[in-house]
């Protein structure tokens, strides 16, 4: 049967507290994904920036995740209104704000 | 890394207005709650103002309430604070700051001037 969005959500949030808590070295290497500047469509538009970086094991269950939340297809490379043109940040940092806007949307029972 | 860059401070005399905006880089801004706090010269630090993740709700401090208004364009990842009718007491550094309640999360700029005198 499907999961219900709440308990999805919640299980994202857990995976990404797992990769913030359990982080010893650089995350993915310290790869760079864009920035996006747009509140709309958080779950693609955090895919769209995520699913360019490759080799991560720590964030493919992530990734993952994501594509469930996200309704259209999403590849590597694609262009989207909501990343911030030549604004790139570093992984780590990205999980981290991701986590906790998710923690918010979840208190505010956004939960797709 | 990430970094709140406060401008806009200055002189103004009392009555005068200015906008203090906050440009942010180095994290995802539109999904934070942020705000604005001050400190005046000798003074604490004062909550001023803030606005939600997606600007649809504000608080402000009773001190600056119908005077000031916060807002913010997600697109540029900037903060505003807008004063009008500034007074002598309005004088402090204001800070750009995150807002959220979780640990870890707290970022602040440096910092702009803002003197209010005749």
């Known amino acids: 049967s499907p999961v219900p969005p709440s308990t999805a959500l919640k299980e994202l949030i857990e995976e990404l507290v797992n990769i913030t808590q359990n982080q010893k070295a650089p995350l993915c290497n310290g790869s760079m994904v864009w920035s996006i500047n747009l509140t709309a469509g958080v779950y693609c538009a955090a895919l769209e920036s995520l699913i360019n970086v490759s080799g991560c094991s720590a964030i493919e269950k992530t990734q993952r995740m994501l594509n469930g939340f996200c309704p259209h297809k999403v590849s590597a490379g694609q262009f989207s209104s909501l990343r911030v043109r030549d604004t790139k940040i570093e992984v780590a940092q990205f999980v981290k704000d991701l986590l906790v806007h998710l923690k918010k949307l979840f208190r505010e029972g956004q939960f797709n | 890394g990430v970094q709140l860059l406060e401008s806009g401070g200055g002189l103004v005399q009392p009555g005068g207005s200015l906008r203090l905006s906050c440009a942010a880089s180095?994290?995802?801004?539109?999904?934070?709650?942020m705000g604005w706090v001050r400190q005046a010269p000798g003074k604490g630090l004062e909550w001023v103002s803030s606005?939600?993740?997606?600007?649809?709700?504000?608080y402000y401090a009773d001190s600056v309430k119908g005077r000031f208004t916060i807002s913010r364009d997600n697109s540029k990842n900037t903060l505003y604070l807008q004063m009008n009718s500034l007074r002598a007491e309005d004088t402090a550094v204001y800070y750009c700051?995150?807002?959220?309640?979780?640990?870890?999360?707290?970022?602040w700029g440096q910092g702009t001037l803002v003197t209010v005198s005749s």
């Open positions: 700051a995150t807002a959220e309640d979780e640990p870890g999360y707290d970022y």
């Open positions: 180095g994290f995802v801004f539109p999904w934070y709650d």
């Open positions: 606005i939600d993740w997606k600007g649809g709700k504000t």
